[in-house]
Structures are given as C-alpha cells and as structure tokens.
C-alpha cells in the first residue's frame, strides 16, 4: 500500500516517501527503490535554511555599499547574510535593502530614542520647562536653567527652543 502521507523531514514522490535534504544542502536526486535521496552542499555564497527539496540554493544577500549597506553577519550554507547600515544611516525596511540618513530633531524637539541600524531617530516635542535650540540626531530636550539656584531671577522666559535668560535680582534702595 503506497503511503499518502510521510513522516517529518520526508516528502512524497512517485508513491514513496523520500528524505528531505538538510539545511545547507540541495536536492540532486529523489530517492528511488534502490537509492536514498541524494543531496549536495550549497556552493560558496549560497544557502538553504530549512529541510528542503530545492534543486537550487539561494544566493546570499549582497550588502551594497552604494546603498549605505554593510555586512552585519556573514551568511553560511544554512543562513542568509544579514545587512545593516553604515553609521548615521538606518534601514528603510525590515529586509534592510537600502538605507536612509537618520533624521535630526528640529529645534523645539529632542531625541526620545537614538536611531539604530534598523530604526530611525524618534523625536518628541520639548515639554514646558525644557528646550532644544539645535537640529540634532542625538540631543535630548534640556531643562531650562534654574535661575533660583544661582540666586538669579528670570529676565526672559524660556520657550521650547530657547533657554530662560537669568539676571541679577533688583536691589532694594
């Protein structure tokens, strides 16, 4: 009675169950009555990451420096190459096929989360009591200067883009 289903790591062909090829190897011949499934290792710069019956291995991803990419992890016969972006850039997608420059946070906004190779800068508006007067991919919102602790008084109120201006207290005549 020919099988209708096969065990894990097997596949059904010509009414018989054949072994799948292990990761890192491709199929060159299905099993027969007299021979086992024949597999060959993937070549240099190729991979297969699952038990499979593929007749061709996949090419490793190319991290194109012209697109701002570099190798984060070199591929093996069982894994694809992982790309990331050069310093100051981040991936445009999860697949990391190209990079864009990290965004800067405008004056009035500070960096909530610094960018990584895979995520952009996250900015947040400076709340009352804080300011940012630069466009930066690193600077957080800074607290206004506390004039009181310096025995000074506020001469000019701060905004989300400017610090307060402190001055001496008026002397009583």
């Amino acid at each position: 009675e020919p099988p209708t289903a096969c065990r894990e790591k097997q596949y059904l062909i010509n009414s018989q169950c054949c072994s799948l090829c292990q990761p890192g190897q491709k199929l060159v011949s299905d099993c027969t009555e007299f021979t086992e499934t024949e597999c060959l290792p993937c070549g240099e710069s190729e991979f297969l990451d699952t038990w499979n019956r593929e007749t061709h291995c996949h090419q490793h991803k190319y991290c194109d420096p012209n697109l701002g990419l570099r190798v984060q992890q070199k591929g093996t016969s069982e894994t694809d190459t992982i790309c990331t972006c050069e310093e100051g850039w981040h991936c445009t997608s999860e697949a990391c096929e190209s990079c864009v420059l990290h965004r800067s946070c405008s004056p009035g906004f500070g960096v909530k989360q610094i960018a990584t190779g895979v995520s952009d800068t996250i900015c947040e508006p400076c709340p009352v009591g804080f300011f940012s007067n630069v466009s930066s991919a690193f600077e957080k919102c800074h607290p206004w200067t506390s004039c009181e602790t310096k025995d000074l008084v506020v001469q000019q109120a701060g905004t989300n883009k400017t610090d307060v201006v402190c001055g001496p207290q008026d002397r009583l005549r």
Epitope: Q10, C17, V28, S29, C31, F34, T35, T37, E38, L40
Partner: antibody, heavy 114, light 112 residues
Framework: QVQLKESGPGLVAPSQSLSITCTVS????????VHWVRQPPGKGLEWLGV???????SYNSALMSRLSISKDNSKSQVFLKMNSLQTDDTAMYYC????????WGAGTTVTVSS | DVVMTQTPLSLPVSLGDQASISCRSS???????????LHWYLQKPGQSPGLLIY???NRFSGVPDRFSGSGSGTDFTLKISRVEAEDLGVYFC?????????FGGGTKLEIK
C-alpha cells in the same frame, strides 16, 4: 525500456586522454543521473562518478583530478573524460542510470597500451 | 569512503549445495531514513553485473527464491539454498547509502 550503451576508442596510449560516450534511452537525462563504474580485467568494480539530472557532478576523490563528466540532454548522451591514462586504467567501463541499478550498459573495453 | 569486505574470495560448491557469502562494511549502511542500501549482484562470465537482491533482502523481479539476503548495520549475508549451474559466476555486494558508491571485491562461485 531503460537501455544504456557505452562507446569508446578501445585502445589508448599511456599519458593520453580517454573519451567515452554513454547513450541512454527509456529515460530522460533531465530527470535522472548517470553513474560511471569500471572493472579492471579479473578484478572488482570501482565507482568513478555521477552526473546528476541538474548537471551537478560527484567524483571518486582518488580520480577527481583527472576525471570529468558532462552531458548533452538533447542527445541523451553522457560523456566521461579521463586524462593521463596509465596501464592500470585498463578496464571495462560501464554506465548506469541512477535508480536503475538493474540496468547496466554492456560496457566498453579500454586498453591502455603503447 | 565505505570499504566493503567480501568473504570468501572463492567458493567451490557442489550443485545442489547451499552457499553463503559474507559482506562487511567499514561503517553502518543504515541511512537516517532507516533504509539500508546494500545490494547483491551476480556477474556471469562475459556479462555486465545483474541485480539479484536490493536493500538487504528484497529479491529483484525474476530472481529465483533460492536466493536470499539478510543482515543489518555492517554485516550482511547472501545465501543460495540449492546451487544450480546457472548460478556460477562472481557475486558482488554494493552499497549506495553513501556517495561514493562502493563494491565488495567479489566472490567467485565455482564447481567443486
């Protein structure tokens, strides 16, 4: 039905190269591999190599440096080439289809002699 | 490579006798699938090898039931229960579990 027929030069001078053709019928070279096996006179069988359906090859490591197997799918022909022949390469050379262990060619005799 | 060792080299028998040929492999011929690809061939004088037994114990079509194969792992046996004149020739064991395929050195079955 499956058939294989080897044809070769018969006599080869030492240090020269050998070319043998295996013509198959009853199956397609795009779906099955072909193996080469040889047998020196009065001795045992030695596996030489295989060309798989997709064109990949596997060779006997002891002979790899002077052996090459290729094929022409459209003509149903497989070719064995061996370089730098010596007298101990004198043998009957057989081809057989992968998965068709029951069907061997009649073989072609190769004698290496000056 | 897997080395296949066949014994005896020569086996003189009388017609009607039982004959037994041993084949040992240098490593297990059991594939991870559980199958064992050990085969037996008979090569009659002036002919190509002909398949007798495949996967240890399966008789190939048309092979008489006086031929039987047994064994497992690295140790295999071919038995001929009652030798007939047409059985004379050289018997080879062969493994196709591992590439490169390898063959035993052969056992010549001859009349005593």
């Amino acid at each position: 039905q499956v058939q294989l027929k080897e044809s070769g030069p018969g006599l080869v001078a030492p240090s020269q190269s050998l070319s043998i053709t295996c013509t198959v019928s009853g199956f397609s070279l795009t779906s099955s591999g072909v193996h080469w096996v040889r047998q020196p006179p009065g001795k045992g069988l030695e596996w030489l190599g295989v060309i798989w359906a997709g064109g990949d090859t596997s060779y006997n490591s002891a002979l790899m440096s002077r052996l090459s197997i290729s094929k022409d799918n459209s003509k149903s022909q497989v070719f064995l080439k061996m370089n730098s022949l010596q007298t101990d390469d004198t043998a009957m050379y057989y081809c057989l289809g992968h998965g068709h262990l029951d069907v061997w060619g009649a073989g072609t005799t190769v004698t290496v002699s000056s | 490579d897997v080395v296949m060792t066949q014994t005896p080299l020569s086996l003189p028998v009388s017609l009607g006798d039982q004959a037994s040929i041993s084949c040992r492999s240098s490593q297990s011929l059991v594939h991870s699938s559980g199958n064992t690809y050990l085969h037996w061939y008979l090569q009659k004088p002036g002919q190509s090898p002909g398949l007798l037994i495949y996967k240890v114990s399966n008789r190939f079509s048309g092979v008489p039931d006086r031929f039987s194969g047994s064994g497992s792992g690295t140790d295999f046996t071919l038995k001929i229960s009652r030798v007939e004149a047409e059985d004379l020739g050289v018997y080879f064991c062969s493994q196709t579990t591992h590439v490169p395929w390898t063959f035993g050195g052969g056992t010549k079955l001859e009349i005593k």
